[in-house]
Structures are given as structure tokens and as C-alpha cells.
Interface confidence: low
């Protein structure tokens, strides 16, 4: 999957673009918006009817080194009595993000962009019932 | 990928931080991913905290299209299909990394950007504040 060239006619390549070898692109990994603040509802992972846990994976040859993954705690959903209701399903909600992968080839190193699918949290859904004829 | 020679002696690069700027292959390694959440699952309709998906497009960004979730209701859908306001539908937000063309309009020069997206909604028990 290649990054598409911008096709709009008003996007003429400016003179100020840095020279880049063919088949590659220049990537500055200093992050824009590094310190933006997030206002997510408090403790939703434990207050949800489809609660989840978090784990962190760590890989020094990936940038960022850490990726946070959520895992649904239950197959069913938690009802008003605090019991698991298996007539409903807890399902993961996923989102893609980009990482940079460092690869070693002998004494050389190369960099590759990679899409990673992250499980962000869980939601409670009505199951799809398949009726057998 | 684009190969960069390492120093003589080939030290253990596990101890090296990533350089501030890297040259990366234009091909993105991403088997199997489907960027349209409407096609990948119908959870947004079947959830007890359903959401609508809004298309956010920006040609200066990769991916240029990102889908944003907006919860349909303040409450959650109960077993009768009605909205129960004793529960709350809340967005699940995630910070993700995207590529921003820098300088603007350049075809092969990017910078990582952190953006906040609402990915879906989940049904939660509300936090009740008791007034003394």
C-alpha cells in the first residue's frame, strides 16, 4: 500500500520540498501535538457494561516503542445486577495507527512504516443470530 | 526498506534511540487492514451505545480519510429498544499517529502527528454526584 501522491491540481510540488531518494520518503518523527490533553470520561473501562483491561507491548525496534491494547474482560455484558448476561456480547473496538519499524540487515538498518491495529476498548452489542435451516 | 549503513563495528542498535529524521520505504507494511469501519463491522448499529460515523478528510494527512464516531444518544438502548437514561453512552477516544505533509504539499516529506479520534461508544454506569 503506497502513500498516494496528492492528485489535486492546486497541489503543485513546491520548490522548498527536500530532495528524497526514489522509492522512499523523509519522515520527521518529532511528534506534532505531543502534549495535547485528552478529556475522556473517568474509568470508563471499568464502568462499561462491556469492561476491558489494558496491556502495554514494548518493542525497542518500533517507534513508538509502546502500544497499548485493550482486552474485553467478558464474552457477555454486565447487566444492572452486576452479573454477566451472555445473551449480549462484549466486542472489541479497533483503530489503526502508524508506527515506524526498524529492521536490521547485517550491519545495516532500514526503516519501514507499519499500520498497527489497536484495540481501544469494548462495546456491548446484540448478537447476530444465525438460524439453521 | 531504505538501508542506512551503520558505524564500523556494528554496535548493538538496541541501545540506540531512533534518529529524529528517518528515510522510510513508501510501501506501508499493513496486511489485512480495512480503513472503512462501516465495512469492517456493524457494531456501530448493534451496540447498546450506537454511534454514527463521520468522514474526516484532509489531503495533507495520511491516511487522508479518518472516521470519527459520535454517540447517537445520551443514554443506552435497553432490551426493549428504548433509550435508558439511567445509563450513559460515552465515546471511546484514542490518540493515534498519522503523517502530516511537511513542508505542506510535498509529496514525499512527512512528520508524525498525534491526533485524537473517537473510535466508537460504550455504555457506562453514570457517576452520581450526591449533593450534601
Amino acid at each position: 500500500r503506497k502513500i498516494p501522491k496528492v492528485g489535486h491540481t492546486f497541489f503543485q510540488k513546491p520548490e522548498s520540498c527536500p530532495p528524497v531518494p526514489g522509492g522512499s520518503m523523509k519522515l520527521d518523527i518529532g511528534i506534532i501535538n505531543e502534549n495535547q490533553r485528552v478529556s475522556m470520561s473517568r474509568n470508563i473501562e471499568s464502568r462499561s457494561t462491556s469492561p476491558w483491561n489494558y496491556t502495554v507491548t514494548w518493542d525497542p525496534n518500533r517507534y513508538p516503542s509502546e502500544v497499548v491494547q485493550a482486552q474485553c474482560r467478558n464474552l457477555g455484558c454486565i447487566n444492572a445486577q452486576g452479573k454477566e448476561d451472555i445473551s449480549m456480547n462484549s466486542v472489541p473496538i479497533q483503530q489503526e495507527t502508524l508506527v515506524v519499524r526498524r529492521k536490521h540487515q547485517g550491519c545495516s538498518v532500514s526503516f519501514q512504516l507499519e499500520k498497527v491495529l489497536v484495540t481501544v476498548g469494548c462495546t456491548c452489542v446484540t448478537p447476530v443470530i444465525h438460524h439453521v435451516q | 526498506g531504505i538501508t542506512i549503513p551503520r558505524n564500523p563495528g556494528c554496535p548493538n542498535s538496541e541501545d540506540k534511540n531512533f534518529p529524529r529524521t528517518v528515510m522510510v520505504n513508501l510501501n506501508i507494511h499493513n496486511r489485512n487492514t480495512n480503513t472503512n469501519p462501516k465495512r469492517s463491522s456493524d457494531y456501530y448499529n448493534r451496540s447498546t451505545s450506537p454511534w454514527n460515523l463521520h468522514r474526516n478528510e484532509d489531503p495533507e494527512r495520511y491516511p487522508s480519510v479518518i472516521w470519527e464516531a459520535k454517540c447517537r444518544h445520551l443514554g443506552c438502548i435497553n432490551a426493549d429498544g428504548n433509550v435508558d437514561y439511567h445509563m450513559n453512552s460515552v465515546p471511546i477516544q484514542q490518540e493515534i499517529l498519522v503523517l502530516r505533509r511537511e513542508p505542506p504539499h510535498c509529496p514525499n516529506s512527512f512528520r508524525l502527528e498525534k491526533i485524537l479520534v473517537s473510535v466508537g461508544c460504550t455504555c457506562v454506569t453514570p457517576i452520581v454526584h450526591h449533593v450534601a
Epitope: 485528552v38 513508538p64 502500544v67 497499548v68 | 490518540e95 499517529l97 498525534k114
Partner: nanobody, 119 residues
Framework: EVQLVESGGGKVQAGDSLTLSCVAS???????AAWFRQAPGKDRRELVV?????????YTADSVKGRFTASRVNTKNTVYLQMNSLKPEDTAVYYC????????????WGQGTQVTVSS
């Protein structure tokens, strides 16, 4: 602006225990708190332990499993690193960090506290 201050470092013998503390002032710890360390001569910080706001440990480095654990007391804005059965290879500067989502970087870092383990 949140400031993180570590304390509790020092010189100990192999096999000893030590507890490091990290206090957040000017705000609170975000979702995640973590302890990193940077060994002498290394230019990379190693993630040692990561802890979620609920107190659940979300990551422990293989090299410290069964010896190190983290805890946090949110009401005191403090995170702890309990280090048992210390080894000379645990010698490093230990840093405390805080993040909303570590997958896109830690927002705040402490200045570090030195731990030296002699055999």
C-alpha cells in the same frame, strides 16, 4: 504544569531491597505511570514497569519479573517502585514518567534518581 520528582535512590548491596517514590506536583498522574531506567554507558532508557491508574500492572520487563513491582496511591499523587533482590545489573538512573497513552509518548518525566548495586 505537572512536575515529577523521584526519591529513594542510593547505594546498596546485591540482594538488598529499595523503594523508589515519585510524586506528581502541580497536577495528577495521567492514565499511566511508568518507571524507566538508563544504565551507565547506555543511551536508551529501558521501560521497567508500567502501571495503569486503577493500580493494575500493564508491563513488567523480563529482567525484573518477580523482583520489582509498582504501586500507586492516587490520593497522594505518588507512584512507587519496590525493588527486591537487587543485582549489580540493576545499577542505573531510574526515571518516573506519566502518560495518557504511552503508545504515543510519555508527557511528563522526572529528573531521575541514581540506584547503585554493588556485589
Amino acid at each position: 504544569e505537572v512536575q515529577l520528582v523521584e526519591s529513594g535512590g542510593g547505594k546498596v548491596q546485591a540482594g538488598d531491597s529499595l523503594t523508589l517514590s515519585c510524586v506528581a506536583s502541580g497536577g495528577t498522574f495521567s492514565n499511566y505511570a511508568a518507571w524507566f531506567r538508563q544504565a551507565p554507558g547506555k543511551d536508551r532508557r529501558e521501560l521497567v514497569v508500567s502501571i495503569f491508574r486503577t493500580g493494575s500492572i500493564t508491563y513488567t520487563a523480563d529482567s525484573v519479573k518477580g523482583r520489582f513491582t509498582a504501586s500507586r496511591v492516587n490520593t497522594k499523587n505518588t507512584v512507587y517502585l519496590q525493588m527486591n533482590s537487587l543485582k549489580p545489573e540493576d545499577t542505573a538512573v531510574y526515571y518516573c514518567a506519566s502518560a495518557y497513552n504511552p503508545g504515543v509518548g510519555y508527557d511528563y518525566w522526572g529528573q531521575g534518581t541514581q540506584v547503585t548495586v554493588s556485589s
